[in-house]
């Protein structure tokens, strides 16, 4: 707490300017007019304050704005914002995506600060939802932002936001959130044709379920090896051997390098002999010749 | 016979919820998209929203968000919507309909329950 | 919001063609199914993905789409065909559908 003394006569702030970084700390809070402080918010980022200074400032905000900020104020916090607490953020009502954007430059190349995720979901939960422009400007500063969010979080992501999503911005999505996302994606994307449409779908995958990828296999789509590896365990498992060749197209050589790991490994224990003897790939341990394959799914699904 | 079969009619007063079921028989080891189209008495189809096979992922129409739930139970393969703070406008026709095609890329709804008429009134 | 307009009413004789259109802005840049719904009954899919007919729905159905227009073809029309049909389409977050057109029978 910084202590209520009289401003030294001539030293009141008509402005916001570089004098200030030579007040100190007691004459900052006695000559400092927060009202003026406010509107020249802009101001402060382009002068060399202490952390210390910095700490006044927010004082004085603070107490002008208790019940918090006016956006008006907070898009020009610059770096006044890592002195932000996430108790402080709750207490803002941010609408702007360039208000967003301001914040988010102040600590960009940092991790995810706790200030930055409350100011993300106070933003989100303000528009009700994840929109496309949004989406764009979190996974620019943050491209894990997306696999952050819980699965949750993920259903209320409309379709049209899919489309802002990169490759990269889903590498660390476990298959539940692309459980979530694959549907959105396929929404977002049902007015393409074929060839085009799996370029897009391809990324989210992980989320298809078996009916699609055996859809998909009567498309002539060549899906490569990495992608068909981070398909689902259980998606992957009931395709036959004739489905699987359409899937990957030429790319089915790779098989052999990846049949001891999953998905390929699974699947495989699931076919016939014979029938992966037709890859002429040399693939080992599918249900030798002459015995009976019992179906347990539809026992499964019944009990 | 695939079909689909819905709850009956409801009545409900303004600012109350009404939940519709939707249950698969027939064909119920596979499980589809579920969509939701409501229709009012004399105008025209409306979308609701859609559900995902796992009942993880839902997309609703921006009219309605906030205000309706779409859920499934997939031990029984029923299929709900909720829909609250009901208002005269509401009363209309509830129809669920499944996307079971072979596209791999598009939704049609091919398969539709008989409607459910949900009628708001105080 | 997007809207897909089509006519209130067609009228054919039995026999001849009814054509159905459904004007939308780039319409012909997404795919477009097409419903048919009879009083008091549950719609039925006819059309999806502008031209392709579910199994059981008679071949006198086509559907077309380019430009700003799809359009529902009926050959040889028979007077079961009396219904209304509405076409639609997904645009951004939500599908549309058209505002329904009468075909009647004469």
């Known amino acids: 707490e910084v202590e209520k003394t009289a401003c030294p006569s001539g030293k009141k702030a008509r402005e916001i300017d570089e004098s200030l970084i030579f007040y100190k700390k007691w004459e900052l809070e006695a000559c400092v007019d927060a009202a003026l402080l406010a509107t020249q918010m802009d101001r402060v980022n382009a002068i060399p304050f202490t952390y210390e200074q910095l700490d006044v400032l927010k004082h004085k905000l603070d107490e002008l704005y208790p019940q918090g900020y006016p956006e008006s104020v907070i898009q020009h916090l610059g770096y006044l914002f890592l002195k932000m607490s996430p108790e402080d953020i709750r207490k803002w009502n941010v609408t702007s995506l360039e208000t967003l954007k301001a914040l988010l430059e102040v600590n960009k190349g940092h991790e995810m600060s706790p200030q930055v995720a409350t100011l993300i979901d106070r933003f989100v939960k303000g528009r009700g939802q994840l929109d496309k422009d949004t989406l764009d400007t979190l996974t620019a500063f943050y491209p894990g932002y997306l696999c952050s969010l819980s699965p949750e979080e993920l259903s209320s992501v409309p379709p049209s936001s899919i489309w802002a999503v990169r490759p990269q911005d889903l590498d660390t999505c476990d298959p539940r959130q692309l459980d979530v996302l694959y549907p959105k994606a396929r929404l977002a994307f049902q007015n393409m044709n074929g060839s085009e449409y799996f370029v897009k779908i391809q990324s989210f995958l992980g989320g298809a379920p078996t009916e699609d990828l055996k859809a998909l296999s009567q498309q002539n789509v060549s899906m490569d090896l990495a992608t068909f590896m981070k398909l689902r365990t259980d998606a992957v498992l009931p395709l036959t051997v004739a489905e699987v060749q359409k899937l990957l197209g030429p790319h089915v050589e790779g098989l052999k390098a990846e049949e001891r790991h999953r998905p390929v490994r699974d699947w495989i224990l699931r076919q016939r002999q014979d029938d992966l003897d037709t890859l002429g790939l040399g693939l080992q341990g599918g249900i030798p010749n002459g015995y009976l394959v019992l179906d347990l799914s539809m026992q499964e699904a019944l009990s | 016979e695939v079909q689909l079969v819905q709850s009956g009619a409801e009545v409900k007063k303004p600012g109350a919820s009404v939940k519709v079921s939707c249950k698969a028989s027939?064909?119920?080891?596979?499980?589809?998209?579920v969509q939701w189209v409501r229709q009012a008495p004399g105008q025209g189809l409306e979308w609701m929203g859609i559900i995902n096979p796992s009942g993880v992922s839902t997309t609703y129409a921006q009219k309605f968000q906030g205000r309706v739930t779409m859920t499934r139970d997939t031990s029984t393969s029923t299929v709900y919507m909720e829909l609250s703070s009901l208002r005269s406008e509401d009363t209309a026709v509830y129809y669920c309909?499944?996307?079971?095609?072979?596209?791999?890329?598009?939704?049609?709804?091919?398969?539709w329950g008989q409607g459910t008429l949900v009628t708001v009134s105080s | 919001s997007y809207e897909l307009t089509q006519p209130p009413s067609v009228s054919v004789s039995p026999g001849q063609t009814a054509s159905i259109t459904c004007s939308g802005d780039?319409?012909?840049?997404?795919?477009a199914s097409w419903y048919q719904q009879k009083p008091g009954q549950s719609p039925v899919l006819v059309i999806y993905q502008d031209n392709r007919r579910p199994s059981g729905i008679p071949e006198r159905f086509s559907g077309s789409n380019s430009g700003n227009t799809a359009t529902l073809t009926i050959s040889g029309t028979q007077a079961m065909d009396e219904a209304d049909y509405y076409c639609?389409?997904?645009?951004?977050?939500?599908?549309?559908f058209g505002t329904g057109t009468k075909v009647t029978v004469l």
């Open positions: 780039k319409l012909g840049d997404k795919y």
């Open positions: 309909a499944e996307s079971r095609g072979s596209g791999y890329n598009y939704f049609a709804m091919d398969v």
């Open positions: 027939g064909d119920t080891f596979k499980r589809y998209y």
């Open positions: 639609q389409a997904w645009d951004s977050d939500t599908y549309v």
